[in-house]
Interface confidence: medium
Amino acid sequence: LIIGFGISGRHSITVTTVASAGNIGEDGILSCTFEPDIKLSDIVIQWLKEGVIGLVHEFKEGKDELSEQDEMFRGRTAVFADQVIVGNASLRLKNVQLTDAGTYKCYIITSKGKGNANLEYKTGAFSMPEVNVDYNASSETLRCEAPRWFPQPTVVWASQVDQGANFSEVSNTSFELNSENVTMKVVSVLYNVTINNTYSCMIENDIAKATGDIKVTESEIKRRSHLQLLNSKAS
């Protein structure tokens, strides 16, 4: 959580941002909130990025003002116009690129004063894994697949029954470059699994951690997936 204050005493307002991560090729949100004003026309929102000359986005007098927007963000940004009045200055970023990573500043002017806060935005690729029984294999085998990751993650298997066991010698993980030559498909195979057990395939890079669970008995196979973004710190 980053909370920023305006520079000049009583004319400062609180601005809060949350560090977040964007999934390349998808839409992302850069989160920013501020003390609301009663008049929309008195609110100015500016988004800036360190190292970028033009603005990322500007909203003033109730509408977008994009005359000074940097070329790299052209047609890719929007604020939630109907929520600005209640103090939401978050920015929607379309088609997130690797190069969108960096430090952003959310700068706010209202009739009460000014304020700003920085936000660290990471970009990469992350996806939910799915774990299935691989009936094509010649031993009892599980296959964990996740379609898009970047940077290259680590993959670790765990089991409810054999807690703390090291499965590295009975598993095999491969990374296959996807067609856009950035993200990779993750495939990990676990051998010699046993019935009546729950196995977890955990995929992690510096942006996200995802887990795919599978419980196998003779009468049911239950799957569950979970994805968590790392370092989502508010400022």
């Epitope: 009936y135 009892e140 699994v193 019935i195 003779e218 009468s219 049911e220 196979i221 239950k222 799957r223």
Partner: antibody, heavy 119, light 108 residues
Framework: QVQLVESGGGVVQPGRSLRLSCAAS????????MHWVRQAPGKGLEWVAV????????YYADSVKGRFIISRDNSKDTLYLQMNSLRAGDTAVYYC????????????WGQGTLVTVSS | EIVMTQSPATLSVSPGERATLSCRAS??????LGWYQQKPGQAPRLLIY???TRATGIPARFSGSGSGTEFTLTISSLQSEDFAVYYC??????????FGGGTKVEIK
């Protein structure tokens, strides 16, 4: 408990079609691959076809390939076998079977439905 | 395809005696073998999977052994309800999944 109940068998003329159904209960049907196995009168067991848990993959015995279609409706917990261009050699009791939790042995079987192909 | 061969075709045993059934695979199938029991007019029932693991509810008198290409089902002391046809099945390599031709265990 696991239950598999086949239906749809009967007498049919060569060259005609028949559709078998298998209603499943007592387990999470949508999570398991399902099979059809048949047994000609007085003969042994012959595996016919399998369909993956989500219906995305099907495999067939050579003897029925191109004539039989296995399918499933996970919303109805039902397995199907569409049998086309039937021959006298297809006469058998057809069993629906559930794959084991980790491998393709047949953990549970239905009671079977008799298909007789005769003119 | 993997061919499964069972022997003998018929086994005559007295109640209380031991019965030994054999199953041979045309190539190695590791331990990926199941044994089934079928009584007249009934569906088959899984006895053994993984060559040696008894399925749920199967009495301890049934045991399986072997790996690779040679497998054995042993019934230590035959009960009257054990007289039936027994099939082995490989699930190591498929399609197709293949069964042996069966062994009929009859009363001597």
């Amino acid at each position: 408990q696991v239950q598999l109940v086949e239906s749809g068998g009967g007498v049919v003329q060569p060259g005609r079609s028949l559709r078998l159904s298998c209603a499943a209960s007592g387990f999470t049907f949508r999570s398991f691959g399902m099979h059809w196995v048949r047994q000609a009168p007085g003969k042994g067991l012959e595996w016919v076809a399998v369909i993956s848990y989500d219906g995305s993959n099907e495999y067939y015995a050579d003897s029925v390939k191109g004539r039989f279609i296995i399918s499933r409706d996970n919303s109805k917990d039902t397995l199907y076998l569409q049998m086309n261009s039937l021959r006298a050699g297809d006469t058998a009791v057809y069993y629906c079977a559930k794959g084991g939790g980790l491998r393709w042995y047949f953990a549970y079987w239905g009671q079977g439905t008799l298909v007789t192909v005769s003119s | 395809e993997i061919v499964m061969t069972q022997s003998p075709a018929t086994l005559s045993v007295s109640p209380g005696e031991r019965a030994t059934l054999s199953c041979r695979a045309s190539q190695s199938i590791s331990s990926n073998l199941g044994w089934y029991q079928q009584k007249p007019g009934q569906a088959p029932r899984l006895l053994i999977y993984g060559a040696s693991t008894r399925a749920t509810g199967i009495p301890a008198r049934f045991s399986g052994s072997g790996s690779g290409t040679e497998f054995t089902l042993t019934i230590s002391s035959l009960q009257s309800e054990d007289f039936a046809v027994y099939y082995c099945q490989q699930y190591n390599s498929w399609p197709p999944l293949t069964f042996g031709g069966g062994t009929k265990v009859e009363i001597k």
